[in-house]
């Protein structure tokens, strides 16, 4: 990695005059669970925790639920969606279900979102077992501009799991574009 | 990357004095399939190779099944579980399995466990295909303090595929704390 | 991280002299649509983009569908690779698919390949929906050596999804080897 | 409901300026990005620029670079539009609109009610 | 820029007829396409969005299709209230740009 290049306008020797420079930017981002919308169709995720629990941000913003990059560089971006079902909340709203999350990147430079990464699973829950739980993962290494901003879309939003180690999406800096 | 300063104690200025600053922490620590608990209940896994294939620990150590952080940072954390089922091995516990995994911090300062991560799935096991394969994969950014622990809790031990390709758990360190 | 010491033969005083290195090894592939294999035998996919869309490579080679490593070091890998199926595609090869992938090393001084990661799951696609969708993530933390390849090996690449955001592999140098 | 109104018709001569407002109501302002897009008498529909209202990002149509400065004010959930060296050729009917980025739409809705906008020496 | 060229720009129907408008793209812009109604005097409406979805509200006679540089809005039985300038938009990339429009009167 380029390590603290990525945050400086000078040189290596600057940095070394200078001391530690700034953090390089990171978020790791939990779901608001008293903000999960309803419904079964598709829908972005508005509302993200950025300081309790596991959640964290550093030279990152969040903002109507969209993680916006302040500082141009390559990101390890990631996603971890979790749906689950008790036959005690009622029936799913079809047996077969597609369980579905995109990471999506939108910017004031592009009209339309483009879908980053996606990942999921169609799924029978219908009777038989009274508990069902299912989790996707995905992640991948992108350049992202300042000004950009990340968000997370999902099927079925009425079957996440609200627990801050089950649905959450993050970032980290990993070098500087040249 | 705050790159070097997360792993001295001086200035930038010491380190291109001294030259190379120490590698950053790490593990990525593989099954051991001798060890591997039976049953269908919730287990820790307290056994896991880190010196041979493709396991291996730098400024980390690891302890009863337990991976312990020897110096603050950010790390990114990740765990790939795999199930397999043979006819041939007899029947599953259960035909509605929850194949789940859980990535754990302990702390000698928090008396109890705390969940980072997990994922999985409820499948049906049942009859009609002689061979069932399950993978799971989570992976997220957190913060960790020297002394803090990470442990791999899994539901059905005895259905882990044990290769070294299928069932490991690592970890890296990103940055610094400021 | 190590940062730049990963990329310079010389001391951390010769960085600060010289200003920023050279950007660390990183790569992002992304499935050519035009060449999935049929079938569904276990292949390795042997095409994929570097240029185009989020694809991208530096420091690295993308050489018939291999990923070449030109720098020692540990690397953090990745793998996202989706299977879908519509009714209107014709049936699927068999109602008890095996969806699996395989993340592999070569080395020309190694004749065999070794699986670094696996992830998958069986899966039952006979009839009762039109549509059917599955996705893998794996990642990991491992050393690699110049010369070394990176490759996927998918069973049923008939089904893979096309999309750039289903399907796709990379990897990023976190830090140098001591 | 989900609403944008605009300020009304204007009246300008070559060379100078004119500044639209479209006041939103009815949702988050800062949550969707604002859209200007102007129609000429008898034509068709030209696209000016964009401001995301949470943070001030704007991008504009090339033709107009130099000439249109969009702006908003978070305050009063008001996004405005200013067109400087008005020349005949910008008598149009000005339309701010909303871009739905929340569910995945992407298109325009709704519109203004559109103010008119006449060059005349 | 990306140009959207609209036909026919103008169109004579009877009520109940099936009505049919093109639009094609100078390039490739996925489904990132929308269809807009617009009355004499007012702001234009969104009836269709990503090619082939259409918008809460609007009735099921309207229909959008298409993919990559080639797309179509059908309205299967023209109503009284349908009469009306109908333009097609991409969202692919900026500047956004729309077709000349389809102007549809009555027969």
């Known amino acids: 990695f380029s390590g603290a290049p990525a945050m400086m306008e000078g040189s290596w020797l600057d940095v070394a005059q200078r001391g530690k420079p700034e953090a390089q930017p990171f978020a790791h981002l939990t779901i608001n669970a008293a903000s999960i919308p309803s419904g079964s169709h598709k829908v972005t995720l508005s509302s993200w925790y950025h300081d309790r629990g596991w959640a964290k941000i550093s030279n990152m913003t969040l903002s109507n639920g969209k993680l916006r990059v302040n500082q141009d560089g390559f990101y390890y971006l990631y996603a971890n969606i979790c749906f689950r079902h008790h036959e005690t909340s009622g029936s799913v709203p079809t047996d077969y279900l597609q369980l579905m999350v995109y990471v999506v990147k939108t910017s004031i430079k592009i009209p339309s979102s483009h879908n980053l990464m996606k990942g999921g699973s169609t799924k029978n829950w219908s009777g038989n077992s009274e508990f069902h739980f299912y989790s996707i993962n995905v992640g991948g290494f992108f350049k992202l501009r300042a000004g950009e901003e990340i968000s997370i879309q999902v099927s079925n939003p009425s079957l996440l799991d609200p627990d801050q180690d089950a649905t959450y999406f993050g970032a980290f800096k990993v070098q500087d574009i040249d | 990357f705050s790159g070097a300063p997360a792993m001295m104690e001086g200035s930038w200025l010491d380190v291109a004095q001294r030259g190379k600053p120490e590698a950053q922490p790490f593990a990525h620590l593989t099954i051991n399939a001798a060890s591997i608990p039976s049953g269908s209940h919730k287990v820790t896994l307290s056994s896991w190779y880190h010196d041979r294939g493709w396991a291996k620990i730098s400024n980390m150590t690891l302890s009863n099944g337990k991976l312990r952080v020897n110096q603050d940072g950010f790390y990114y954390l990740y765990a790939n579980i795999c199930f397999r089922h043979h006819e041939t091995s007899g029947s599953v516990p259960t035909d509605y399995l929850q194949l789940m995994v859980y990535v754990v911090k302990t702390s000698i300062k928090i008396p109890s466990s705390h969940n980072l991560m997990k994922g999985g799935s409820t499948k049906n096991w049942s009859g009609n295909s002689e061979f069932h394969f399950y993978s799971i994969n989570v992976g997220g950014f957190f913060k960790l303090r020297a002394g803090e622990e990470i442990s791999i809790q899994v539901s059905n031990p005895s259905l882990l595929d044990p290769d070294q390709d299928a069932t490991y758990f690592g970890a890296f360190k990103v940055q610094d704390i400021d | 991280f190590s940062g730049a010491p990963a990329m310079m033969e010389g001391s951390w005083l010769d960085v600060a002299q010289r200003g920023k290195p050279e950007a660390q090894p990183f790569a992002h592939l992304t499935i050519n649509a035009a060449s999935i294999p049929s079938g569904s035998h276990k292949v390795t996919l042997s095409s994929w983009y570097h240029d185009r869309g989020w694809a991208k490579i530096s420091n690295m080679t993308l050489s018939n569908g291999k990923l070449r490593v030109n720098q020692d070091g540990f690397y953090y890998l990745y793998a996202n690779i989706c299977f879908r199926h519509h009714e209107t595609s014709g049936s699927v090869p068999t109602d008890y698919l095996q969806l699996m992938v395989y993340v592999v090393k070569t080395s020309i001084k190694i004749p065999s390949s070794h699986n670094l990661m696996k992830g998958g799951s069986t899966k039952n696609w006979s009839g009762n929906s039109e549509f059917h969708f599955y996705s893998i993530n794996v990642g990991g933390f491992f050393k690699l050596r110049a010369g070394e390849e990176i490759s996927i090996q998918v069973s049923n690449p008939s089904l893979l999804d096309p999309d750039q955001d289903a399907t796709y592999f990379g990897a990023f140098k976190v830090q140098d080897i001591d | 409901q989900v609403q944008l109104v605009q300020s009304g018709a204007e009246v300008k001569k070559p060379g100078s300026s004119v500044k639209v407002s479209c006041k939103a109501s009815g949702y988050a302002f800062t949550n969707y990005y604002i859209e200007w897009v102007r129609q000429a008498p008898g034509q068709g529909l030209e696209w000016m620029g964009v401001?995301?209202?949470?943070?001030?990002?704007?991008n504009y149509n090339e033709k107009f670079k130099g000439r249109v400065t969009i702006t908003a004010d978070k305050s009063t959930s008001t996004a405005y539009m200013e067109l400087s060296s008005l020349r005949s050729e910008d008598t149009a009917v000005y339309y701010c609109?909303?871009?739905?980025?929340?569910?995945?739409?992407?298109?325009?809705?709704?519109w203004g009610q559109g103010t008119t906008v006449t060059v005349s020496s | 820029d990306i140009q959207m060229t609209q036909s026919p720009s103008s169109l004579s129907a009877s009520v109940g007829d099936r009505v049919t408008i093109t639009c094609k793209a100078s390039?490739?812009?996925?489904?990132?396409v929308a269809w807009y109604q617009q009355k004499p005097g007012k702001a234009p409406k969104l009836l269709i969005y990503s090619a082939s979805y259409r918008y809460s509200g609007v009735p099921s006679r309207f229909s959008g299709s298409g993919s990559g540089t080639d797309f179509t809005l059908t309205i299967s039985s023209l109503q009284p209230e349908d009469f009306a300038t109908y333009y097609c938009?991409?969202?692919?990339?900026?500047?956004?740009?729309f077709g000349g429009g389809t102007k549809v009167e009555i027969k």
């Open positions: 401001i995301n209202p949470g943070w001030g990002d704007t």
């Open positions: 938009q991409q969202y692919w990339d900026y500047p956004l740009t």
């Open positions: 390039q490739n812009v996925g489904t990132n």
């Open positions: 609109a909303r871009r739905d980025t929340a569910h995945g739409y992407y298109a325009l809705d709704p």
